[in-house]
Interface confidence: medium
Protein backbone atom coordinates (compact mmCIF):
# COMPACT_ATOMS: atom_id res chain seq x y z
CA UNK A 1 0.00 0.00 0.00
CA UNK A 2 1.07 3.54 -0.65
CA UNK A 3 2.55 5.83 1.98
CA UNK A 4 0.31 8.87 2.36
CA UNK A 5 1.46 12.48 2.34
CA UNK A 6 -0.67 15.55 2.88
CA UNK A 7 -0.59 19.18 1.81
CA UNK A 8 -3.02 22.06 1.76
CA UNK A 9 -4.23 23.86 -1.33
CA UNK A 10 -1.81 26.63 -2.18
CA UNK A 11 1.11 25.08 -0.36
CA UNK A 12 4.03 23.14 -1.76
CA UNK A 13 3.77 19.37 -1.48
CA UNK A 14 6.83 17.27 -0.68
CA UNK A 15 7.06 13.62 -1.71
CA UNK A 16 10.23 11.99 -0.34
CA UNK A 17 12.28 9.52 -2.34
CA UNK A 18 15.94 8.68 -1.81
CA UNK A 19 18.66 6.39 -3.00
CA UNK A 20 22.38 6.25 -2.32
CA UNK A 21 24.49 6.61 -5.46
CA UNK A 22 27.54 4.39 -5.68
CA UNK A 23 29.46 7.66 -6.05
CA UNK A 24 28.35 11.29 -6.30
CA UNK A 25 29.28 11.38 -9.97
CA UNK A 26 27.63 8.10 -10.83
CA UNK A 27 23.89 8.60 -10.75
CA UNK A 28 21.01 6.28 -11.52
CA UNK A 29 18.25 7.68 -13.74
CA UNK A 30 15.05 8.46 -11.88
CA UNK A 31 11.59 9.28 -13.14
CA UNK A 32 8.56 10.69 -11.37
CA UNK A 33 5.11 10.08 -12.79
CA UNK A 34 1.50 10.78 -11.91
CA UNK A 35 -0.22 7.49 -11.30
CA UNK A 36 0.94 4.20 -9.82
CA UNK A 37 4.20 2.77 -11.10
CA UNK A 38 3.62 0.64 -14.20
CA UNK A 39 5.71 -2.38 -15.13
CA UNK A 40 8.23 -0.21 -16.96
CA UNK A 41 9.12 3.47 -16.87
CA UNK A 42 6.75 6.04 -15.34
CA UNK A 43 3.31 6.93 -16.62
CA UNK A 44 2.51 10.61 -17.15
CA UNK A 45 6.09 11.67 -16.47
CA UNK A 46 6.42 14.98 -14.62
CA UNK A 47 10.18 14.94 -14.03
CA UNK A 48 13.14 12.84 -15.06
CA UNK A 49 16.85 12.70 -14.26
CA UNK A 50 19.60 10.99 -16.22
CA UNK A 51 23.12 10.01 -15.21
CA UNK A 52 24.12 13.65 -14.69
CA UNK A 53 21.23 16.13 -14.80
CA UNK A 54 17.55 16.78 -14.44
CA UNK A 55 16.77 16.44 -18.13
CA UNK A 56 12.99 16.84 -18.17
CA UNK A 57 10.50 18.59 -15.96
CA UNK A 58 7.10 20.15 -16.22
CA UNK A 59 5.84 23.32 -14.64
CA UNK A 60 5.50 23.26 -10.83
CA UNK A 61 7.54 20.07 -10.40
CA UNK A 62 11.16 20.18 -9.27
CA UNK A 63 13.82 18.60 -7.09
CA UNK A 64 14.83 20.91 -4.30
CA UNK A 65 17.15 18.49 -2.55
CA UNK A 66 20.63 17.44 -3.57
CA UNK A 67 19.63 14.97 -6.24
CA UNK A 68 23.26 14.20 -7.06
CA UNK A 69 23.58 12.72 -3.58
CA UNK A 70 20.42 10.70 -4.02
CA UNK A 71 17.74 13.03 -2.69
CA UNK A 72 15.25 12.81 -5.54
CA UNK A 73 12.30 13.96 -3.46
CA UNK A 74 9.68 15.73 -5.54
CA UNK A 75 8.37 19.18 -4.74
CA UNK A 76 5.06 20.22 -6.29
CA UNK A 77 4.53 23.94 -6.11
CA UNK A 78 1.24 25.62 -5.22
CA UNK A 79 -0.89 22.48 -5.20
CA UNK A 80 -4.55 22.28 -6.05
CA UNK A 81 -7.10 19.57 -5.33
CA UNK A 82 -6.39 18.17 -8.79
CA UNK A 83 -2.86 17.24 -7.65
CA UNK A 84 -4.27 14.58 -5.33
CA UNK A 85 -3.48 11.02 -6.24
CA UNK A 86 -0.74 8.44 -6.53
CA UNK A 87 2.77 9.42 -7.64
CA UNK A 88 5.47 7.02 -8.74
CA UNK A 89 9.14 7.46 -7.91
CA UNK A 90 11.15 4.98 -9.98
CA UNK A 91 14.87 4.41 -9.44
CA UNK A 92 15.96 3.03 -12.81
CA UNK A 93 18.73 0.66 -11.80
CA UNK A 94 20.51 -0.87 -14.81
CA UNK A 95 19.57 -4.45 -15.62
CA UNK A 96 16.39 -6.31 -16.33
CA UNK A 97 13.64 -5.78 -13.75
CA UNK A 98 16.05 -4.16 -11.30
CA UNK A 99 14.10 -0.91 -10.90
CA UNK A 100 12.97 0.14 -7.46
CA UNK A 101 9.40 1.49 -7.52
CA UNK A 102 7.72 3.55 -4.85
CA UNK A 103 4.10 4.65 -4.90
CA UNK A 104 3.33 7.70 -2.79
CA UNK A 105 -0.18 8.93 -2.18
CA UNK A 106 -0.72 12.68 -2.07
CA UNK A 107 -3.81 13.95 -0.33
CA UNK A 108 -4.64 17.61 -0.82
CA UNK A 109 -6.78 19.25 1.82
CA UNK A 110 -8.67 22.49 1.31
CA UNK A 111 -6.88 25.51 2.73
CA UNK A 112 -7.79 26.23 6.32
CA UNK A 113 -10.05 29.24 6.70
CA UNK A 114 -9.24 31.07 9.90
CA UNK A 115 -11.18 34.01 11.35
CA UNK A 116 -9.58 37.37 10.69
CA UNK A 117 -7.44 38.38 13.65
CA UNK A 118 -8.49 41.41 15.65
CA UNK A 119 -5.18 43.10 14.95
CA UNK A 120 -2.82 42.73 12.05
CA UNK A 121 0.32 40.70 12.46
CA UNK A 122 3.27 39.87 10.27
CA UNK A 123 2.83 36.85 8.10
CA UNK A 124 5.66 34.88 6.59
CA UNK A 125 4.73 32.35 3.96
CA UNK A 126 5.84 28.85 4.76
CA UNK A 127 6.93 28.34 1.18
CA UNK A 128 8.68 30.85 -1.07
CA UNK A 129 7.09 31.67 -4.37
CA UNK A 130 8.95 30.07 -7.26
CA UNK A 131 8.99 31.06 -10.90
CA UNK A 132 7.56 28.33 -13.10
CA UNK A 133 7.68 29.71 -16.58
CA UNK A 134 9.18 26.54 -18.00
CA UNK A 135 6.87 23.95 -19.49
CA UNK A 136 9.41 21.38 -20.56
CA UNK A 137 12.98 20.29 -20.04
CA UNK A 138 16.02 21.62 -21.83
CA UNK A 139 16.83 20.79 -25.42
CA UNK A 140 20.10 18.96 -25.62
CA UNK A 141 21.93 16.25 -27.50
CA UNK A 142 23.27 13.50 -25.30
CA UNK A 143 25.15 10.27 -25.59
CA UNK A 144 25.60 8.86 -22.15
CA UNK A 145 27.49 5.88 -20.92
CA UNK A 146 28.69 4.82 -17.50
CA UNK A 147 29.84 7.72 -15.40
CA UNK A 148 32.96 8.09 -13.31
CA UNK A 149 33.80 5.82 -10.45
CA UNK A 150 35.24 7.45 -7.35
CA UNK A 151 37.53 5.64 -4.96
CA UNK A 152 36.79 5.32 -1.27
CA UNK A 153 39.18 8.10 -0.33
CA UNK A 154 37.38 10.45 -2.69
CA UNK A 155 34.00 9.39 -1.36
CA UNK A 156 35.20 10.07 2.17
CA UNK A 157 36.53 13.46 1.13
CA UNK A 158 33.32 14.26 -0.67
CA UNK A 159 31.27 13.27 2.33
CA UNK A 160 33.29 15.61 4.50
CA UNK A 161 33.43 18.47 2.03
CA UNK A 162 29.96 18.62 0.60
CA UNK A 163 27.30 20.57 2.40
CA UNK A 164 24.85 18.52 4.41
CA UNK A 165 21.95 17.96 2.08
CA UNK A 166 18.33 17.39 2.97
CA UNK A 167 19.02 13.71 3.49
CA UNK A 168 18.22 14.09 7.17
CA UNK A 169 17.57 10.86 8.98
CA UNK A 170 14.00 11.70 9.79
CA UNK A 171 13.24 12.44 6.16
CA UNK A 172 15.12 9.38 5.05
CA UNK A 173 13.15 7.26 7.48
CA UNK A 174 9.84 8.65 6.28
CA UNK A 175 10.53 8.29 2.59
CA UNK A 176 11.61 5.71 0.08
CA UNK A 177 15.28 4.84 0.30
CA UNK A 178 17.38 2.42 -1.70
CA UNK A 179 21.10 1.78 -1.62
CA UNK A 180 22.83 1.48 -5.00
CA UNK A 181 26.27 -0.05 -5.38
Amino acid sequence: SEVEYRAEVGQNAYLPCFYTPAAPGNLVPVCWGKGACPVFECGNVVLRTDERDVNYWTSRYWLNGDFRKGDVSLTIENVTLADSGIYCCRIQIPGIMNDEKFNLKLVIKPAKVTPAPTRQRDFTAAFPRMLTTRGHGPAETQTLGSLPDINLTQISTLANELRDSRLANDLRDSGATIRIG
Epitope: R52, F67, T75, P138, E140, Q142, G145, L162, R163, S165
Partner: antibody, heavy 120, light 107 residues
Protein backbone atom coordinates in the same frame (compact mmCIF):
# COMPACT_ATOMS: atom_id res chain seq x y z
CA UNK B 1 49.55 19.88 -9.93
CA UNK B 2 46.58 19.93 -12.24
CA UNK B 3 47.13 21.81 -15.48
CA UNK B 4 45.06 22.33 -18.60
CA UNK B 5 47.11 23.71 -21.48
CA UNK B 6 45.26 24.82 -24.59
CA UNK B 7 46.40 25.29 -28.16
CA UNK B 8 47.28 28.70 -29.55
CA UNK B 9 45.17 31.43 -31.07
CA UNK B 10 43.40 30.83 -34.37
CA UNK B 11 42.18 33.13 -37.12
CA UNK B 12 39.54 31.62 -39.39
CA UNK B 13 37.31 32.72 -42.23
CA UNK B 14 33.53 32.44 -42.05
CA UNK B 15 32.39 28.93 -42.97
CA UNK B 16 35.63 27.31 -41.87
CA UNK B 17 36.19 24.98 -38.92
CA UNK B 18 38.43 25.24 -35.90
CA UNK B 19 39.72 22.51 -33.61
CA UNK B 20 40.97 23.54 -30.18
CA UNK B 21 43.00 21.17 -28.02
CA UNK B 22 43.32 20.97 -24.25
CA UNK B 23 46.11 18.84 -22.79
CA UNK B 24 45.50 17.73 -19.22
CA UNK B 25 48.15 16.76 -16.68
CA UNK B 26 48.44 16.21 -12.96
CA UNK B 27 45.38 13.99 -12.57
CA UNK B 28 43.73 10.89 -14.02
CA UNK B 29 42.27 12.24 -17.23
CA UNK B 30 39.54 9.61 -17.55
CA UNK B 31 38.10 10.26 -14.08
CA UNK B 32 36.71 13.73 -14.72
CA UNK B 33 34.38 15.44 -17.13
CA UNK B 34 35.81 18.04 -19.46
CA UNK B 35 33.48 20.90 -20.30
CA UNK B 36 33.96 23.66 -22.85
CA UNK B 37 32.93 27.25 -22.22
CA UNK B 38 33.37 30.30 -24.42
CA UNK B 39 33.46 34.03 -23.84
CA UNK B 40 32.86 36.55 -26.60
CA UNK B 41 34.79 39.84 -26.36
CA UNK B 42 33.49 41.88 -23.43
CA UNK B 43 30.71 39.35 -22.84
CA UNK B 44 29.79 36.66 -20.34
CA UNK B 45 30.36 32.92 -20.26
CA UNK B 46 28.51 30.42 -22.44
CA UNK B 47 28.54 26.63 -22.02
CA UNK B 48 29.12 24.58 -25.17
CA UNK B 49 29.00 21.05 -23.80
CA UNK B 50 30.97 18.33 -22.06
CA UNK B 51 32.70 15.05 -22.73
CA UNK B 52 33.43 12.25 -20.29
CA UNK B 53 36.79 10.88 -21.45
CA UNK B 54 36.31 7.44 -19.93
CA UNK B 55 33.67 6.43 -22.45
CA UNK B 56 33.31 9.37 -24.79
CA UNK B 57 29.84 10.30 -23.54
CA UNK B 58 28.92 13.83 -24.58
CA UNK B 59 26.24 16.43 -24.07
CA UNK B 60 26.08 19.53 -26.25
CA UNK B 61 24.27 22.79 -25.87
CA UNK B 62 21.40 22.63 -28.36
CA UNK B 63 22.46 26.04 -29.66
CA UNK B 64 25.54 24.41 -31.17
CA UNK B 65 23.98 21.11 -32.19
CA UNK B 66 25.38 19.89 -35.46
CA UNK B 67 28.27 22.36 -35.36
CA UNK B 68 30.25 21.19 -32.36
CA UNK B 69 32.03 17.91 -31.72
CA UNK B 70 34.00 17.02 -28.62
CA UNK B 71 36.50 14.20 -28.59
CA UNK B 72 39.37 12.97 -26.46
CA UNK B 73 42.62 11.11 -26.94
CA UNK B 74 43.15 9.10 -23.78
CA UNK B 75 46.71 8.15 -24.77
CA UNK B 76 47.78 11.81 -24.62
CA UNK B 77 45.21 13.02 -22.06
CA UNK B 78 43.99 15.58 -24.55
CA UNK B 79 40.47 16.88 -25.15
CA UNK B 80 39.39 18.48 -28.41
CA UNK B 81 36.57 20.78 -29.33
CA UNK B 82 35.78 21.28 -33.01
CA UNK B 83 33.38 24.00 -34.13
CA UNK B 84 32.29 24.03 -37.76
CA UNK B 85 30.60 26.52 -40.08
CA UNK B 86 32.15 29.40 -38.20
CA UNK B 87 30.43 32.78 -38.12
CA UNK B 88 31.68 36.16 -37.01
CA UNK B 89 29.75 35.83 -33.75
CA UNK B 90 31.81 32.72 -32.92
CA UNK B 91 34.73 35.05 -32.24
CA UNK B 92 35.52 34.34 -28.61
CA UNK B 93 37.95 32.91 -26.12
CA UNK B 94 37.30 29.19 -25.79
CA UNK B 95 38.08 27.51 -22.48
CA UNK B 96 38.31 23.90 -21.46
CA UNK B 97 37.33 23.38 -17.84
CA UNK B 98 37.54 20.29 -15.66
CA UNK B 99 34.49 19.11 -13.77
CA UNK B 100 35.52 19.49 -10.16
CA UNK B 101 36.82 17.08 -7.56
CA UNK B 102 34.17 18.04 -5.03
CA UNK B 103 31.50 18.72 -7.62
CA UNK B 104 31.60 17.19 -11.07
CA UNK B 105 29.31 19.98 -12.22
CA UNK B 106 31.33 23.08 -11.44
CA UNK B 107 34.80 23.75 -12.79
CA UNK B 108 37.81 23.73 -10.49
CA UNK B 109 40.49 24.03 -13.17
CA UNK B 110 40.37 26.03 -16.39
CA UNK B 111 42.65 26.19 -19.39
CA UNK B 112 44.27 29.50 -20.22
CA UNK B 113 41.85 30.00 -23.10
CA UNK B 114 42.22 29.91 -26.86
CA UNK B 115 41.28 33.01 -28.82
CA UNK B 116 39.40 32.20 -32.01
CA UNK B 117 38.85 35.09 -34.38
CA UNK B 118 36.44 34.67 -37.27
CA UNK B 119 36.91 37.33 -39.89
CA UNK B 120 36.73 37.60 -43.64
CA UNK C 1 16.91 27.19 -20.94
CA UNK C 2 17.18 28.25 -17.32
CA UNK C 3 18.01 31.95 -17.18
CA UNK C 4 20.32 33.24 -14.44
CA UNK C 5 19.96 36.95 -13.76
CA UNK C 6 22.55 38.72 -11.64
CA UNK C 7 22.15 42.01 -9.83
CA UNK C 8 23.60 44.50 -9.85
CA UNK C 9 25.43 44.58 -13.19
CA UNK C 10 28.21 46.57 -11.53
CA UNK C 11 28.99 48.10 -8.19
CA UNK C 12 31.70 50.15 -6.54
CA UNK C 13 32.43 49.48 -2.88
CA UNK C 14 34.96 50.89 -0.45
CA UNK C 15 37.76 48.69 0.86
CA UNK C 16 36.72 46.80 3.97
CA UNK C 17 33.02 47.09 3.18
CA UNK C 18 30.62 44.21 2.75
CA UNK C 19 29.66 43.20 -0.81
CA UNK C 20 26.52 41.31 -1.81
CA UNK C 21 25.87 39.99 -5.32
CA UNK C 22 22.55 38.37 -6.12
CA UNK C 23 21.63 35.76 -8.67
CA UNK C 24 18.08 34.72 -9.54
CA UNK C 25 17.20 31.58 -11.48
CA UNK C 26 14.16 31.50 -13.75
CA UNK C 27 13.09 28.24 -12.10
CA UNK C 28 14.17 26.30 -9.06
CA UNK C 29 17.63 24.79 -9.36
CA UNK C 30 17.90 23.41 -5.84
CA UNK C 31 21.42 24.11 -4.59
CA UNK C 32 23.07 23.47 -7.94
CA UNK C 33 24.80 26.81 -8.30
CA UNK C 34 28.48 27.76 -8.52
CA UNK C 35 30.16 31.16 -8.31
CA UNK C 36 33.27 32.18 -10.27
CA UNK C 37 35.64 35.12 -10.14
CA UNK C 38 37.29 36.38 -13.31
CA UNK C 39 40.00 39.01 -13.27
CA UNK C 40 40.93 40.90 -16.45
CA UNK C 41 42.90 38.75 -18.87
CA UNK C 42 42.54 35.63 -16.74
CA UNK C 43 40.48 32.47 -16.79
CA UNK C 44 37.59 32.20 -14.32
CA UNK C 45 38.30 30.76 -10.88
CA UNK C 46 35.89 28.67 -8.82
CA UNK C 47 34.85 30.30 -5.55
CA UNK C 48 31.72 28.47 -4.39
CA UNK C 49 30.17 25.16 -5.39
CA UNK C 50 26.79 23.70 -4.49
CA UNK C 51 25.59 27.20 -3.53
CA UNK C 52 27.38 27.46 -0.20
CA UNK C 53 30.59 25.41 -0.25
CA UNK C 54 33.78 27.44 -0.37
CA UNK C 55 36.32 25.93 -2.74
CA UNK C 56 39.74 24.95 -1.45
CA UNK C 57 42.04 27.92 -1.00
CA UNK C 58 39.31 30.54 -1.34
CA UNK C 59 39.55 33.15 1.44
CA UNK C 60 36.87 32.81 4.09
CA UNK C 61 35.62 36.34 3.42
CA UNK C 62 33.79 34.78 0.46
CA UNK C 63 30.57 32.95 1.23
CA UNK C 64 27.57 31.73 -0.72
CA UNK C 65 23.99 31.12 0.29
CA UNK C 66 20.60 30.40 -1.16
CA UNK C 67 18.52 27.59 -2.57
CA UNK C 68 15.75 27.27 -5.10
CA UNK C 69 15.73 30.42 -7.18
CA UNK C 70 17.61 33.00 -5.11
CA UNK C 71 21.33 32.92 -4.45
CA UNK C 72 23.82 35.32 -2.93
CA UNK C 73 27.58 35.71 -3.02
CA UNK C 74 28.92 37.76 -0.11
CA UNK C 75 32.36 39.26 0.43
CA UNK C 76 32.47 40.18 4.09
CA UNK C 77 35.28 42.71 3.81
CA UNK C 78 36.36 43.87 0.37
CA UNK C 79 40.06 43.65 -0.45
CA UNK C 80 41.84 45.31 -3.37
CA UNK C 81 42.53 41.94 -5.00
CA UNK C 82 38.78 41.18 -5.16
CA UNK C 83 38.29 43.58 -8.08
CA UNK C 84 36.92 41.31 -10.80
CA UNK C 85 33.80 40.16 -12.59
CA UNK C 86 31.74 37.57 -10.71
CA UNK C 87 29.51 34.99 -12.39
CA UNK C 88 26.93 32.59 -11.04
CA UNK C 89 26.22 29.36 -12.91
CA UNK C 90 23.47 26.78 -12.61
CA UNK C 91 24.32 23.13 -13.13
CA UNK C 92 20.90 21.70 -12.34
CA UNK C 93 20.12 20.95 -15.96
CA UNK C 94 21.96 21.35 -19.22
CA UNK C 95 22.50 23.56 -21.02
CA UNK C 96 24.27 24.95 -17.99
CA UNK C 97 23.86 28.69 -17.94
CA UNK C 98 25.73 31.59 -16.41
CA UNK C 99 24.58 34.93 -15.13
CA UNK C 100 25.59 37.96 -17.18
CA UNK C 101 28.26 38.87 -14.65
CA UNK C 102 28.69 41.54 -11.97
CA UNK C 103 31.64 43.89 -12.24
CA UNK C 104 33.07 44.80 -8.85
CA UNK C 105 35.23 47.90 -8.47
CA UNK C 106 36.76 49.86 -5.63
CA UNK C 107 35.07 53.12 -4.67
Amino acid sequence: QVQLVQSGAEVKKPGASVKVSCKASGYTFTDYYMDWVRQAPGQGLEWLGYIYPNNGGTSYNQKFKGRVTMTTDKSTSTAYMELRSLRSDDTAVYYCARGGYYSYYSYDYWGQGTTVTVSS
Amino acid sequence: DIVMTQSPDSLAVSLGERVTINCKASQSVGNNVAWYQQKPGQSPKLLIYYASNRYTGVPDRFSGSGSGTDFTLTISSLQAEDVAVYYCQQHYSSPYTFGQGTKLEIK
